[in-house]
């Protein structure tokens, strides 16, 4: 059965450049690794922001990456992308994979649109 | 350039035991996913086997599974299929072929075949 | 499983026709679709992944275009050399399945 992966379209990253977003895929197969993957879209280049496997044991992901976390429950993947500029405001999608045990499936979100706003510098004082 | 030869084929009795290779050359093995892909005579093509990049994962075709295993040795840049309780359906030109293994939105494809290997099964 | 199906499974064309090849996949698979090239006694060849995307090196009178479980590979100008039998195959879920094949030949 295809699975169907879905996000919020749009996300407003805080003013300390940190956006949160759920990635849940249905239906809710009876899988022991997951491995999921954030994208961003740029015109027509797509990048790796970040990627990881989770299981059942490990379900805190993306040790490896400096600005992606994520917390994985059933077929709920919450994700943090932290350190964002306003240049890094864009489309971002996550990929689901079904790794293990077999079939392999692989399933792909519409993506989430964040925005990110520079803050103001602070004005000097006196 | 990119190049996988396979060998190892030949003709075998039922229910005896066949292991294939693959050598590559021209790329960085271990960087790449490895598929088997059969063709009986005269018919079309069958998926028979994946393993990731790795080594991680290994996928089989519902055909083979419990009776083909793949493998590889990425220090000898050589992909194996070996092939248990073979029966006569099993005959065919056995192809290996690259898969990038990570292909953002692109899935899985194979992009460079080798030219086959016969397998015969017949008493 | 995923079945693959090919229309038509066969067809003749003549040098500089426009040749339509469609495929058809039991359920959505996205556009996690290629298409390859066989010729007889020879390793098949990739010419599209992606649904959509042109192998390098390849031809750029071979199109594909599709996504769901509706895909079609289209030859704008058939060359001599084209005349071959044309597989889908899906990407989307193991086993990765192949279509059953179009075989073009000389009208």
């Known amino acids: 059965e295809a699975i169907q992966v879905t996000q919020p379209s749009v996300v407003l990253a805080s003013s300390h450049g940190v956006a949160s977003f759920p990635c849940e895929y249905s239906p809710s197969h009876n899988t022991d690794e997951v491995r999921v993957t954030v994208l961003r879209q740029t015109n027509d280049q797509m990048t790796e922001v970040c990627a990881t496997t989770f299981t059942e044991k490990n379900t805190v992901g993306f040790l490896d990456y400096p600005f992606c976390s994520g917390t994985f429950n059933e077929s709920r993947v919450n994700l943090t992308i932290q350190g964002l500029r306003a240049v890094d405001t864009g489309l971002y999608l996550c990929k689901v994979e079904l790794m293990y045990p077999p079939p392999y499936f692989v399933g792909m979100g519409n993506g989430t649109q964040i925005y990110v706003i520079d803050p103001e510098p602070c004005p000097d004082s006196d | 350039q990119v190049q996988l030869v396979e060998s190892g084929g030949g003709v075998v009795q039922p229910g005896r035991s066949l292991r294939l290779s693959c050598a590559a050359s021209g790329f960085t093995f271990s960087s790449y996913g490895m598929h088997w892909v059969r063709q009986a005579p005269g018919k079309g093509l069958e998926w028979v086997a994946v393993i990731w990049y790795d080594g991680s994962y290994k996928y089989y075709a519902d055909s083979v599974k419990g009776r083909f295993t793949i493998s590889r040795d990425d220090s000898k840049n050589t992909l194996y299929l070996q092939m248990s309780s073979l029966r006569a359906e099993d005959t065919a030109v056995y192809y290996c072929?690259?898969?990038?293994?990570?292909?953002?939105?692109?899935?899985?494809?194979?992009?460079?075949w080798g030219q086959g290997t016969l397998v015969t099964v017949s008493s | 499983d995923i079945q693959m199906t090919q229309s038509p499974s066969s067809l003749s064309a003549s040098v500089g026709d426009r040749v339509t090849i469609t495929c058809r996949a039991s359920?959505?698979?996205?556009?996690?679709l290629n298409w390859y090239q066989q010729k007889p006694g020879k390793a098949p060849k990739l010419l599209i992944y992606a649904a959509s995307s042109l192998q390098s090196g390849v031809p750029s009178r071979f199109s594909g275009s599709g996504s769901g479980t509706d895909f079609t590979l289209t030859i704008s100008s058939l060359q001599p050399e084209d005349f071959a039998t044309y597989y889908c195959?899906?990407?989307?879920?193991?086993?990765?399945?192949f279509g059953p094949g179009t075989k073009v030949d000389i009208k």
């Open positions: 072929a690259r898969a990038p293994h990570y292909a953002i939105l692109t899935g899985y494809y194979e992009d460079y």
């Open positions: 359920q959505s698979i996205s556009s996690y």
């Open positions: 195959q899906q990407s989307y879920s193991t086993p990765f399945t």
